[in-house]
């Protein structure tokens, strides 16, 4: 014969757990069915009667089987610095993420509590390191023989063109202008920026995932852009 | 709950050295730590941070000399490859939990770290 | 970013009087800066966070106020036990100290 199947609310075996989408209820001592992603344990059960679920209300969600008396709160509306990546449904929270030209300045756990913009590296100084999701752009002051003459967080330090005959020297914000009609540069035209963001690992506070990272995402908005920084502007 | 370093010793520069953060009273899964370091007579120095996904932040000037992990009931500092500027009284600290800001609340004794030829 | 500073470096005040810090972050962090005080030998006692909030058990005598980049933490009626060094603290992924203010209690 085959064996029963039991329907919740049920007493289980002594030793044996509860099956897949029930849970063990230590008031009724019994096993109960689970309520499904979007909905909330609106009656606990009792020895009788299975758990009563009820949806969840607007702006709020449960995103796994659940006995939770009330659903969760979604986060707040994503502000003017983020992009909404995911909406507030009954089954998901609202995931924001900050946009282009910013990054995830406080994340502690899945989500993103502030954005910040990437800073911009300032004439005479290109960027060292890339942004990224979460880390901000490295400067650096461009080296003897390089250049570096935009407001950019993206821009790197370019060699001077050399000349036959040199009209102006280069310095560290400015190329060498030449007399002669035909300067030769010592590097490829196209490389000039660094795409952006670029993953790397020795990126300043760049997380190190174990096992993956968590998506960025952001609830609470920054005061203001960021101020001037050595070798940077937050303009 | 308490939070207490072990490992700090004399060693002579380019010897790995690793740190201990031992806790006791604390589910590691529910807060994140942190590492930090004073110099004799100087200030604060955050090393790094490690949330309880895994993921792990370091300050820039640490990215790569130094590595954080982390057991069921400790939270260990590696120092890779210390030199003289690493001498430094170390210091473990449990973060107040959340998700809001990072702020620590509870911080062991520390542990002295000497690195000299 | 990360780059605290804070100010002044020392301060004398008398018993029972107030003693006002400062602190300037170099890029906008809202309200996520904390205030620990330090005694010689001890690790840091975290007093403030949220830029206002009091930690547990930490008298209402401290207070601190500020958002964005300037942030101030007020130490009212001072005793004897409040001399101490004062750092504070950016509680954004990039954590950074201010360099400590010293409070003599004369």
């Known amino acids: 014969l085959p064996a029963q199947v039991a329907f919740t609310p049920y007493a289980p075996e002594p030793g044996s757990t509860c099956r897949l989408r029930e849970y063990y209820d230590q008031t009724a001592q019994m096993c109960c069915s689970k309520c499904s992603p979007g909905q909330h344990a609106k009656v606990f059960c009792t020895k009788t009667s299975d758990t009563v679920c009820d949806s969840c209300e607007d702006s709020t969600y449960t995103q796994l089987w659940n006995w939770v008396p009330e659903c969760l709160s979604c986060g707040s509306r994503c502000s003017s610095d983020q992009v909404e990546t995911q909406a507030c449904t009954r089954e998901q929270n609202r995931i924001c993420t900050c946009r282009p030209g910013w990054y995830c300045a406080l994340s502690k756990q899945e989500g993103c509590r502030l954005c910040a913009p990437l800073r911009k590296c300032r004439p005479g100084f290109g960027v060292a390191r890339p942004g990224t999701e979460t880390s901000d752009v490295v400067c650096k002051p461009c080296a003897p023989g390089t250049f570096s003459n935009t407001t950019s967080s993206t821009d790197i330090c370019r060699p001077h063109q050399i000349c036959n005959v040199v009209a102006i020297p280069g310095n560290a914000s400015m190329d060498a202008v030449c007399t002669s009609t035909s300067p030769t540069r010592s590097m490829a035209p196209g490389a000039v920026h660094l795409p952006q963001p670029v993953s790397t690992r020795s990126q300043h506070t760049q997380p190190t995932p174990e096992p993956s990272t968590a998506p960025s995402t952001s609830f609470l908005l920054p005061m203001g852009p960021s101020p001037p920084a050595e070798g940077s502007t937050g303009d | 709950q308490s939070v207490e370093e072990s490992g700090g010793r004399l060693v002579t520069p380019g010897t790995p050295l690793i740190l201990t953060c031992t806790v006791s009273g604390i589910d590691l899964s529910n807060y994140a730590m942190g590492w930090f370091r004073q110099a004799p007579g100087e200030g604060l120095e955050w090393i790094g941070s490690?949330?309880?996904?895994?993921i792990t932040y370091y300050a820039n000037w640490a990215e790569g000399r130094f590595t954080i992990s982390r057991t069921s009931t400790t939270v260990d500092l590696e120092i890779t490859s210390p030199t003289t500027e690493d001498t430094a009284t170390y210091f473990c600290g449990r973060d107040v939990g959340g998700d809001g800001g990072w702020y620590f609340n509870l911080w062991g004794p520390g542990t002295l770290v000497t690195v000299s030829s | 970013a990360g780059d605290m500073t804070q100010t002044p470096a020392s301060v004398e005040v008398a018993v029972g009087g107030t003693v006002t810090i400062k602190c300037q972050a170099s890029?906008?962090?809202?309200?996520?800066l904390a205030w620990y005080q330090q005694k010689p030998g001890q690790p840091p006692k975290l007093l403030i966070y949220d830029a206002s909030k009091l930690a547990s058990g930490v008298p209402s005598r401290f207070s601190g106020s500020g958002s964005g980049t300037e942030f101030t933490l007020t130490i009212s009626d001072l005793e004897c036990a409040d001399a101490a060094t004062y750092y504070c603290q950016q509680g954004i992924n990039n954590i950074g100290f201010g360099g400590g203010t010293e409070v003599v209690v004369k």
């Open positions: 890029q906008s962090i809202n309200i996520y």
């Open positions: 490690r949330r309880t996904d895994g």
